[in-house]
Amino acid sequence: EGSEREENVEKEGLCNACAWRQNTRYSRIEAIKIQILSKLRLETAPNISKDAIRQLLPRAPPLRELIDQYDVQRDDSSDGSLEDDDYHATTETIITMPTESDFLMQADGKPKCCFFKFSSKIQYNKVVKAQLWIYLRPVKTPTTVFVQILRLIKPMKDGTRYTGIRSLKLDMSPGTGIWQSIDVKTVLQNWLKQPESNLGIEIKALDENGHDLAVTFPGPGEDGLNPFLEVKVTDTPKRSRR
Amino acid sequence: EGSEREENVEKEGLCNACAWRQNTRYSRIEAIKIQILSKLRLETAPNISKDAIRQLLPRAPPLRELIDQYDVQRDDSSDGSLEDDDYHATTETIITMPTESDFLMQADGKPKCCFFKFSSKIQYNKVVKAQLWIYLRPVKTPTTVFVQILRLIKPMKDGTRYTGIRSLKLDMSPGTGIWQSIDVKTVLQNWLKQPESNLGIEIKALDENGHDLAVTFPGPGEDGLNPFLEVKVTDTPKRSRR
Amino acid sequence: DFGLDCDEHSTESRCCRYPLTVDFEAFGWDWIIAPKRYKANYCSGECEFVFLQKYPHTHLVHQANPRGSAGPCCTPTKMSPINMLYFNGKEQIIYGKIPAMVVDRCGCS
Amino acid sequence: DFGLDCDEHSTESRCCRYPLTVDFEAFGWDWIIAPKRYKANYCSGECEFVFLQKYPHTHLVHQANPRGSAGPCCTPTKMSPINMLYFNGKEQIIYGKIPAMVVDRCGCS
C-alpha cells in the first residue's frame, strides 16, 4: 500500500510538473503575443478573416518575394542579425491597398480606382522606392497596350481634373495576365509633403481596341489582383530618450 | 520606552539597508570586474604600476586622440551604439611597443631597436592600417633629416642583413621634436603570414651631420617617446555556434 | 561561448535555454502572413552566484534586500530579431524587423 | 519607452534602473588607460506579471516551479557597450569596444 501511495505521489508530481509546464508554456506564449502587439504598436490584433486575407493579399511578385525571402525564420536562428535592442519593430516595406474616396466617383455613383491613404508616420525623405503595381488581364491575341497613370487634381478653370504621372507602351502576348510596376516615388513624396494634394489616381491600360485591361475592381476569380503600392522605406529606429 | 525601541529598530533597519547597499555595491562591482577580465580574455588584471604606464604610454597624437575620442562614456550613454550583444570585446586599435630580441644585438651586446611581437590572433587580412610611429629629437638649426626603416633578414651570401622598407626625407626646424609615422601595412601583413620572417627592424634618422635623431631607447625625460606600432584592425566578432 | 542548451527532458537545474515554438496559426493570428511559426525559446533554471553570469547589473547577493530583488536570475543574454510580414489592420501589409524575438543564449543576470 | 529610472533615495519598489559608477582608479586598475571611470548602472526591484516586461522569455508564472526559476525578474533589457583603452600585459595597448557594459534600461524578463 505504501509503495502504491508513493507511486501515486510520484504520478501526481509528474502531473503537477506537466500541468505546470503547460501552464507556463501558455503564459509564455500569451506574454509573447502581448509583446508582439506592443512592438508593432498595435492595440489589439487586427480583426481580419482568412477569407479577407485571401481577397486582399496581392498575388504580385514583390509579395511572393517577401514571403520567399525567409522561411520566415530558418532553424538556424543565429543566422539572423545581432540584437539591435531597441524595442519597436522597424518597417522596411509597406504594401498599401487602395481605399475608397469621395473624389473618385463615377457618374453612376460607383467608386473609381484608386485612392491610397498614407500614414503620417511615413516621412517623404525616408522613401527609398515606391512602385505602383497593376495587373493587366490576359489578351486573346498579341496586342500593344497603352498604360496611363493619371493624378486627380482640383478642377482647373478649363475643367481639367487629371494630370499625367506616367505613360508607357507595352506588348502583350496571349496567355496569362501580367503584373506591371510603375515608379511613383516622386508623386508619393509630393503627397507626403502635401497630403491635401493626394486626391487619388486613375489607371488606364487600353488595348488597340480600346478595352481597359487594368484590374481596378477585381471581378470573380480576381482576388489579390487589385492595384497596390509597394513602398520601401529606411527606418532608422529612434533612440529612446530618458 | 516603546518609541525608543521603535526608533532603534528603525535606525537598525536603516543601518541594515545601508550595509546591504554597501555590500551589494561591492558585490556588483566585483562581478563587473570579473566580467571585464573575461570579456577582455584576461585571466588576471595585468600587473603594471603607474610609473611603468607613464614610461610606456606613448606621447604621440594617436594616443591622445584615442583618449579624447570618448569621455570614455558620455553621460548620455545611449549616444553610444546599440548593444551588438556578443560577449567578448572587439579590438579596433592595437598599439604595440617594441620588445627585446636575440637577433637585434649590437656588437657590445646591447639590444638594438626594434622587435615587435605579434599575437597570432591578428589575421593579416583584417589589418586596415599599420603605422610605425617614431619620435625625432629636436634640432638646434634647420636641417634635413633622412629617415630609413630597415628590415632585418637572415644573412645572405654577400653578408646582407637588412633590406629597406621605407625611406623619406624631411625638413626639421629648431624647436621641439616631432612624431613621424610611416606606413608599414604590407610589411606587417607579410610578418603575420610568415611569422618566422619577423626578425626586427632598424630605425635611422640621420641629420646632415650624421647624428641619429630617432629616439629608439629613451634617455632621461624621454618617457613615452619609444617607437611603437599602431595597428587598426577590423574585428567582426565571430557568431557563436551552438 | 557561455549559455547552456537544454530540452524539456533535461535534468539540468541550472540556468538553461529551452525550446519554445510560437505558432501563429495555432492561436488564429491569420493577420501574420509570414512566418506562420517561429522558434522563440526561453530561459529557465537556477542561478548560483557567478554561474553563467553575463550582465552583472542586477543584484548579486542573496541577502535581505530592501528592494525585493532576489539575486541574479536566469534571463536572455543574447537575442535576435525576426522579419515579419503582417497586415496592420489599415489596408496595409508591412514587412519589417521585430527586435528581440528569439532567445539565442541564456545567462544569470 | 518603458523602463523606470530611480536613484538610491527612491522609494520605488518596482523594477527600476539605479546609478552605479565603476571607478577603475579607485580599485587600482591603472592598466585601464581610459575611461578612468564609467556609469554602469544596475537593475533592481520587484516584478509583477506584466509590469515593464520586455522579453517574455523567462518564467512568467508564480507557481511551484520544477526548475526553480522564480517568475519574471528585474534585469537589463537594453545595454550598450563602452570603448576602452587598456594595457593587455603583453607590451600592447588595445583600444576596443566591450559589449554590454552599460545598463540603459531595465525591465521584467
Epitope: - | 586622440e65 583618449i67 579624447d68 569621455d71 621641439t176 613621424q180 | - | -
Partner: antibody
Framework: QVTLKESGPVLVKPTETLTLTCTVS????????ISWVRQAPGKGLEWVGI???????YYASWAKGRLTISKDTSKNQVVLTMTNMDPVDTATYYC?????????????WGQGTLVTVSS | DIVMTQSPATLSLSPGERATLSCTSS????????LSWFQQKPGQPPKLLIY???TLAYGVPSRFSGSGSGTDFTLTISSLQPEDAATYYC??????????FGQGTKVEIK
C-alpha cells in the same frame, strides 16, 4: 622654418559668421594636431577647439553648435568657422601646434589675429 | 564645466626672489599629469614652459620647475629675473576632448 599664421576678417557684425584660416609651413597636418585658443582684450586664454592629426574634431562646450574646424592638408590650412557671432566673441584668435596640456602641445603658436564683433 | 583656479591673481616680487604660482582644477586632470604651464607677455602669443606637470620644455631656463599631481599643481621660479615679468597660465587636459586654461597669474617685478 616652422610657422603658423592666422588670417581672416578684422571686423565682423553681430549674428554673422567668422571664418579664420591658420596656414602652416614646415608642419605636416596629417601628423599634427592643431588647436585654436582665443583671448578677449585684457582677459585670459580660452580653449576653443582642436582638429586632430586624423581629422577628428573636439570643441569647447560653449562652442558646440556654433563652431566648425576643418583642414585641407594639401593646402597646409586649418579653417575655423564660428556662426552667430556676438560682441562677447571679440578676441585675439590663436592657432597652435599640438594640444595645450597634452605632451609638448602648444610649443608653437601663431601671432594671433584680433577679431572685433561690432555693428 | 571644469574650472581651473590660479592663485594669486597678481604676484609682486623682487629680482632673485622665489615665485610660487598655484593652479587648482575642479576635477583631476587626465592621468594625473596632463597639465602645462605657459608664459605670456603683452602683445605676444603664449610660450610653453612646462608639460606633463613637471617636464621642462625645450629651451626653457632651469629656474622654472613644475610639480603636483591630480588637481593641485605648482609652478616655481627659483630666482626671478626681470624678463620673467609676464602672465602665467596653467592648462589642463581631461580626456574626452576637454581642455581648460586657468585665468592667469600676473607676475610683476618690483
Amino acid at each position: 622654418q616652422v610657422t603658423l599664421k592666422e588670417s581672416g576678417p578684422v571686423l565682423v557684425k553681430p549674428t554673422e559668421t567668422l571664418t579664420l584660416t591658420c596656414t602652416v609651413s614646415g608642419i605636416d597636418l596629417s601628423h599634427t594636431d592643431i588647436s585654436w585658443v582665443r583671448q578677449a582684450p585684457g582677459k585670459g586664454l580660452e580653449w576653443v577647439g582642436i582638429i586632430s592629426y586624423a581629422g577628428k574634431k573636439y570643441y569647447a562646450s560653449w562652442a558646440k553648435g556654433r563652431l566648425t574646424i576643418s583642414k585641407d592638408t594639401s593646402k597646409n590650412q586649418v579653417v575655423l568657422t564660428m556662426t552667430n557671432m556676438d560682441p562677447v566673441d571679440t578676441a585675439t584668435y590663436y592657432c597652435a601646434r599640438g594640444v595645450p596640456a597634452y605632451s609638448h602641445g602648444g610649443d608653437l603658436w601663431g601671432q594671433g589675429t584680433l577679431v572685433t564683433v561690432s555693428s | 564645466d571644469i574650472v581651473m583656479t590660479q592663485s594669486p591673481a597678481t604676484l609682486s616680487l623682487s629680482p632673485g626672489e622665489r615665485a610660487t604660482l598655484s593652479c587648482t582644477s575642479s576635477q583631476s586632470v587626465y592621468h594625473a599629469n596632463w597639465l602645462s604651464w605657459f608664459q605670456q607677455k603683452p602683445g605676444q602669443p603664449p610660450k610653453l614652459l612646462i608639460y606633463w606637470a613637471s617636464t621642462l620644455a625645450y629651451g626653457v631656463p632651469s629656474r622654472f620647475s613644475g610639480s603636483g599631481s591630480g588637481t593641485d599643481f605648482t609652478l616655481t621660479i627659483s630666482s626671478l629675473q626681470p624678463e620673467d615679468a609676464a602672465t602665467y597660465y596653467c592648462a589642463g587636459g581631461y580626456g574626452g576632448g576637454r581642455y581648460a586654461f586657468g585665468q592667469g597669474t600676473k607676475v610683476e617685478i618690483k
